[in-house]
Interface confidence: low
């Protein structure tokens, strides 16, 4: 439906205060290294000129598309060449080339500073004196460094933000109350950028089908109740939000998302008996509530699969009619059927499923040639669950320090062009699949894990995109979304690479690590242990264990030690030559 | 055009050896895993062994310790050592080339595959 001004449109849908931060959002998205104030000040430019165009939609350019608008704004920013350089370009563009080319230049590592929580009663000071400034730079500093944030999620996170110091800045132990608070946003926050970040990878990477498929298979697990048509309807309103999200179309997101959300709970009896404590939720918090929602128990007495998908006569007409639709009901049929697998999996047994049909339909005997199909979606099936098993096992049996040094080690060994910190950071979170998935029963195992690790994977490829240094990852990245986990796992040693020169200064270690917390120590640890992989690829465990082990011991006698400064010297050089003696190096 | 070629198959006794070979053409050989694969008649085709592009080698149980997969890279081949055989391994011997390992393990859309060869036991 059109609108003779999207602008006032998208403002009156979404009101001021939801209007301002998600520009503000969007606008820290494009332009990553500009500074809180500037944004601002775009932002509220924007926003009184979206009110003159609410007051009279036939005004000046309130016709133009936002695209227009907002990249006339960015591109009014006078340090745009200095700052971003080749960026700059993308202002002599017309839309929509020119979004096109913002969207181009996000960062998924931008040059930030890390941020430093201040102390407690520093931020609540903070807080009280300008409550909105301090939130609209929460919002800043998340979107920055996280440019495909989902920006109505953002929304969500700020709320909590916002709860979490009018509650803990008034009680007795701040601290206390806040800290582990904030602590708790920054893990989901870090979850929630990663994951859709995967869902953008999806659909700028492998196009909207794929991100469709993605959908039908979580949606159908998720609301086995749902007639198809229901799900279909909700899968083509959720690829259009996302679309838009990513996409940088961020008011039209959220307001598409919240169009959703009310639609979801206007539907209820005929989606899901799930939804109802969700339903009864203020917006925010009501779309966060569906999209994390449990799934739905199955329907009882659901008939085999095989007699519409294999033992019809009509698989091959019914295929032929309508490819994508049938193929979509087989997966949602699947699906629902099992929310036990992965969503991965699923659909890699769609793929196994639409070949086999390819094949057979031109086949001189269609129902001979595909009648055995289910048979080979058996050893899809148990790769997954044979990987899990035996990497819970390594986990219960090391612990989730020990078993994401393991990883590193073999991620090291497999992809060793890869940077330090990236390789450091990939196998943190691939390691966390334990603490995360390891608890459940096996029937949650695999949707909980190998889902997991395609988003962590996706870090990985999104990183490496930036700087190429790995065919090897480039390939398990760009040949198939849903085959990357079994692609890297394929992956074994670079018999290719030639072994880091050695380097003492990078086993050189101060005194300053004593006072880092328990996680930054480890990754301390953990990028020596990189290094020294990178050093000697062919090292055994024992002798990085050895190595480990040794390094644990000389971090705590010199963190004891009165002279911390001088035993780091001296040690250092002890355990250096040890360690290059002990692996030849 | 990538073609995979294997040979070596026939009539063998029980307790017998044979050695299969499969020529590759058309693909960078030494990135490629490989595998060999069986099928028995009214069976399903199943892995048996598979050699990957750094030379780590797996079999199946039925296979362990009595085959040996190995490659020449400089001959574009990989071969089959079958040694004690039984009548249970009477079969057509595929041979089939993938980028990944767990591709050809699993018989996960396998990019290449040969014509196959006989190989029959008698007891």
């Known amino acids: 439906d059109a609108h003779k001004s999207e602008v006032a449109h998208r403002f009156k849908d979404l009101g001021e205060e939801n209007f301002k931060a998600l520009v503000l959002i969007a606008f820290a998205q494009y332009l990553q290294q500009c500074p809180f104030e500037d944004h601002v000040k775009l932002v509220n430019e924007v926003t009184e000129f979206a009110k003159t165009c609410v007051a009279d939609e036939s005004a000046e350019n309130c016709d133009k598309s936002l695209h227009t608008l907002f990249g006339d704004k960015l591109c009014t920013v006078a340090t745009l060449r200095e700052t971003y350089g080749e960026m700059a370009d993308c202002c002599a563009k017309q839309e929509p080339e020119r979004n096109e080319c913002f969207l181009q230049h996000k960062d998924d590592n931008p040059n930030l500073p890390r941020l430093v929580r201040p102390e407690v009663d520093v931020m609540c000071t903070a807080f009280h004196d300008n409550e909105e400034t301090f939130l609209k730079k929460y919002l800043y500093e998340i979107a920055r460094r996280h440019p495909y944030f989902y920006a109505p999620e953002l929304l969500f996170f700020a709320k909590r933000y916002k709860a979490a110091f009018t509650e803990c800045c008034q009680a007795a132990d701040k601290a206390a109350c806040l800290l582990p608070k904030l602590d708790e946003l920054r893990d989901e926050g870090k979850a929630s950028s990663a994951k859709q970040r995967l869902k953008c990878a999806s659909l700028q990477k492998f196009g909207e089908r794929a991100f469709k498929a993605w959908a039908v298979a979580r949606l159908s697990q998720r609301f086995p109740k749902a007639e198809f048509a229901e799900v279909s309807k909700l899968v083509t309103d959720l690829t259009k939000v996302h679309t838009e999200c990513c996409h940088g179309d961020l008011l039209e997101c959220a307001d598409d998302r919240a169009d959703l959300a009310k639609y979801i709970c206007e539907n209820q009896d005929s989606i899901s008996s799930k939804l109802k404590e969700c339903c009864e939720k203020p917006l925010l918090e009501k779309s966060h509530c569906i999209a994390e929602v449990e799934n739905d128990e199955m329907p009882a007495d659901l008939p085999s699969l095989a007699a519409d998908f294999v033992e019809s006569k009509d698989v091959c007409k019914n295929y032929a009619e309508a490819k994508d639709v049938f193929l979509g009901m087989f997966l949602y049929e699947y699906a629902r059927r099992h929310p036990d697998y992965s969503v991965v999996l699923l659909l890699r047994l769609a793929k196994t499923y639409e070949t086999t049909l390819e094949k057979c339909c031109a086949a001189a005997d269609p129902h001979e040639c595909y009648a055995k199909v289910f048979d080979e979606f058996k050893p899809l099936v148990e790769e997954p669950q044979n990987l899990i098993k035996q990497n819970c096992e390594l986990f219960e049996q090391l612990g989730e320090y020990k078993f994401q040094n393991a990883l590193l080690v073999r991620y090291t060994k497999k992809v060793p062009q890869v940077s330090t910190p990236t390789l450091v950071e990939v196998s943190r979170n691939l390691g966390k699949v334990g603490s995360k998935c390891c608890k459940h029963p096996e029937a949650k195992r695999m949707p909980c894990a190998e889902d997991y690790l395609s988003v962590v994977l996706n870090q990985l490829c999104v990183l490496h995109e930036k700087t190429p240094v790995s065919d090897r990852v480039t390939k398990c990245c760009t040949e198939s979304l849903v085959n990357r986990r079994p692609c890297f796992s394929a992956l074994e040693v670079d018999e290719t690479y030639v072994p880091k020169e050695f380097n003492a200064e990078t086993f050189t270690f101060h005194a300053d690590i004593c006072t880092l917390s328990e996680k930054e120590r480890q990754i301390k640890k953990q990028t020596a242990l990189v290094e020294l992989v990178k050093h000697k690829p062919k090292a055994t465990k024992e002798q990085l264990k050895a190595v480990m082990d040794d390094f644990a011991a000389f971090v705590e006698k010199c963190c004891k030690a009165d002279d911390k400064e001088t035993c780091f010297a001296e040690e250092g050089k002890k355990l250096v030559a040890a360690s290059q003696a002990a692996l030849g190096l | 055009e990538v073609q995979l070629v294997e040979s070596g198959g026939g009539l063998v006794q029980a307790g017998g050896s044979l050695r299969l070979s499969c020529a590759a053409s058309g693909l960078s050989f030494s990135k490629y895993a490989m595998g060999w694969f069986r099928q028995a008649p009214g069976k399903q085709r199943e892995y048996v062994a598979v050699i990957s592009s750094s030379d780590t080698t797996y079999y199946t149980n039925s296979a362990k310790g009595r085959f040996t997969i190995s490659r020449d890279n400089a001959e574009n081949t990989v071969y089959l050592q079958m040694n004690s055989l039984k009548p249970e391994d009477t079969a057509v011997y595929f041979c089939?080339?993938?980028?990944?390992?767990?591709?050809?393990?699993?018989?996960?859309?396998?990019?290449?595959w040969g014509q196959g060869t006989q190989v029959t036991v008698s007891s």
């Open positions: 089939a080339a993938d980028s990944y390992v767990t591709a050809l393990q699993t018989l996960t859309q396998i990019s290449y």
